[in-house]
């Protein structure tokens, strides 16, 4: 459905009337497009969650299901294209195609921004997403990573409420959580997750996941993960897979206990943790005595709080 263009009316006295009609018609068409876009967005959300579930089922069950995954992903891709086209039509913007748009750090990388640091992603007025300050890692494993979480100084408490975890908090150059709403938006295309950790002895480890999706707020920012690779020993995020996000004021865990209050953070608590990357930052000397620290059980166990953690994401199809 395209916005129709009208010629200027011949009679001057009809000009105002025609203009009003034209505006009404345009408004109706924009409203129509908006509701259509809203429906597509909802459908896309539902479809994508089901795609992710299929992906996980495929990877754990058998190879012969791969064609279904391909179908589902192409369906998702097709829907994305439809939405892009509709957005362009409704906003009457032809100056910037979806290929030109800057969505994340990988987009910046492809535009030859190759220095790690703070960048501002432009707002998307049509989708209502504001300007977003992000920290881009343009070096690790090919670059193009958008950092969604960092713990390194311990100067920012992570014992915060649902709204703060939704919107984000902390210093983008220091300790921060980017915000579940932003992370959800960034993971709506097929996305990889990388978790980097450092212990108090200076050892570095990482865990990477072939698929990473954060559901929307209606889904309580549920976590979906694909295959694990890495050198951090046991995969300590798998236990949190397909689990809703919980905070001190919103208990969505799979436990009688309130895990967020026990483990002192906001996280995808199951019952309760195999990892707790948003736990309490303990300094050297206190770092190996507590269950509510920044833990990854598969490496140093349940009472060892790590010195540094970064969580970062980039599109699955990213090519340096």
């Amino acid at each position: 459905q395209k916005l129709s263009k009208h010629k200027t009316p011949a009679q001057p006295q009809l000009k105002a009337a025609n203009c009003c009609e034209e505006v009404k018609e345009l408004k109706a068409q924009v409203a129509n497009l908006s509701s259509l876009l809203s429906e597509l967005n909802k459908k896309q959300e539902r479809d994508w969650v089901s795609v992710v579930m299929q992906v996980m089922e495929l990877e754990s069950n058998s190879k012969r299901m791969e064609s279904r995954l391909t179908d589902a992903e192409s369906k998702y891709s097709e829907m994305n294209n439809q939405i892009d086209i509709m957005q362009l039509q409704a906003a009457q913007t032809v100056t910037q195609t979806s290929a030109d748009a800057i969505y994340d750090c990988s987009s910046l990388y492809q535009k030859n921004y190759r220095i790690s640091g703070v960048y501002k992603l432009p707002p998307d007025d049509f989708l209502g997403s504001p300007e977003l300050e992000v920290f881009c890692d343009m070096e690790t494993s090919g670059g193009g990573w958008t950092i969604i979480q960092r713990r390194k100084s311990g100067l920012v408490s992570f014992y915060r409420d649902w709204k703060q975890y939704k919107q984000g908090f902390g210093s983008i150059r220091g300790d921060f959580w980017l915000g579940n709403e932003h992370i959800h938006r960034l993971s709506r295309q097929p996305t990889r997750l990388r978790v980097e950790m450092e212990d108090w002895e200076g050892n570095l480890r990482y865990a990477e996941y072939s698929h990473f999706v954060l559901g929307n707020e209606l889904n309580s920012y549920r976590l979906f993960l694909g295959n694990y690779t890495g050198n951090v020993g046991n995969d300590a995020l798998q236990y949190h897979n397909n689990t809703a996000f919980s905070t001190k004021d919103k208990d969505n865990d799979n436990c009688l206990d309130k895990c967020a209050q026990l483990r002192k953070g906001g996280y995808w608590y199951n019952c309760c943790t195999d990892s707790n990357l948003n736990g309490v930052y303990y300094r050297l000397g206190e770092h190996n005595k507590h269950l509510d620290g920044i833990t990854w059980y598969g490496w140093h166990g349940s009472t060892y709080s790590l010195k540094r953690v970064e969580m970062k994401i980039r599109p699955e199809d990213f090519k340096p």
């Epitope: 300007e131 300050e133 014992y159 915060r160 409420d161 984000g168 210093s171």
Partner: antibody, heavy 120, light 108 residues
Framework: QVQLQESGPGLVKPSETLSLTCTVS??????????WSWIRQPPGKGLEWIGY???????SYNPSLKSRVSISVDTSKNQFSLKLSSVTAADTAVFYC????????????WGQGTLVTVSS | DIQMTQSPSSLSASVGDRVTITCRAS??????LNWYQQKPGKAPNHLIY???SLQSGVPSRFSGSGSGTDFTLTISSLHPEDFATYYC??????????FGQGTKVEIK
Amino acid sequence: QVQLQESGPGLVKPSETLSLTCTVSGGSVSSGSYYWSWIRQPPGKGLEWIGYIYYSGSTSYNPSLKSRVSISVDTSKNQFSLKLSSVTAADTAVFYCARAKWEGDYFDYWGQGTLVTVSS
Amino acid sequence: DIQMTQSPSSLSASVGDRVTITCRASQSIYSYLNWYQQKPGKAPNHLIYAASSLQSGVPSRFSGSGSGTDFTLTISSLHPEDFATYYCQQSYSTPPYTFGQGTKVEIK
């Protein structure tokens, strides 16, 4: 040197809405390293945090005031504003705007404060 | 909400005295504690963050200590300009950020 300046009426009638604006100079409300808060102090009493706003428009409010408070930011004017509705005499206080640094979560720069009296 | 309780509410001291103010949290706040000084008719001035880190420009006679629930602000040798009201503030469990009720340091 960062400076903050509160402005708005010094007298508000009960049940009306209190509106204050904080103008920031020597720094930008668009900075991602800080958030911008309102704090009040009733005469002869202690400090009470009202809420904060971040450059992106993200807000957090004191649960005790949540139903009555709204904070907004205007990055083009380098200002942020407070609205407190349905005021009573108990809302009479000196209202401060302040900048808070995320790293350490402390209020490092404050306005000089403005006294708002709620009275008919 | 986490309650912050300061003691004493007020104290009298002389120039040169060592002064100690305590702040107790209703639950552990780890080291997420700040201290402020407020003089009459003025806005508060930040002194210490993370329980013990001195804000730049603050004289070294001010020091902070403690973690968990019990914290202390110490002025090693009281100067005339130090007579003021002191507030502690927690930034661990938010919202809200909560302040102590204040400790007034008066001239003896």
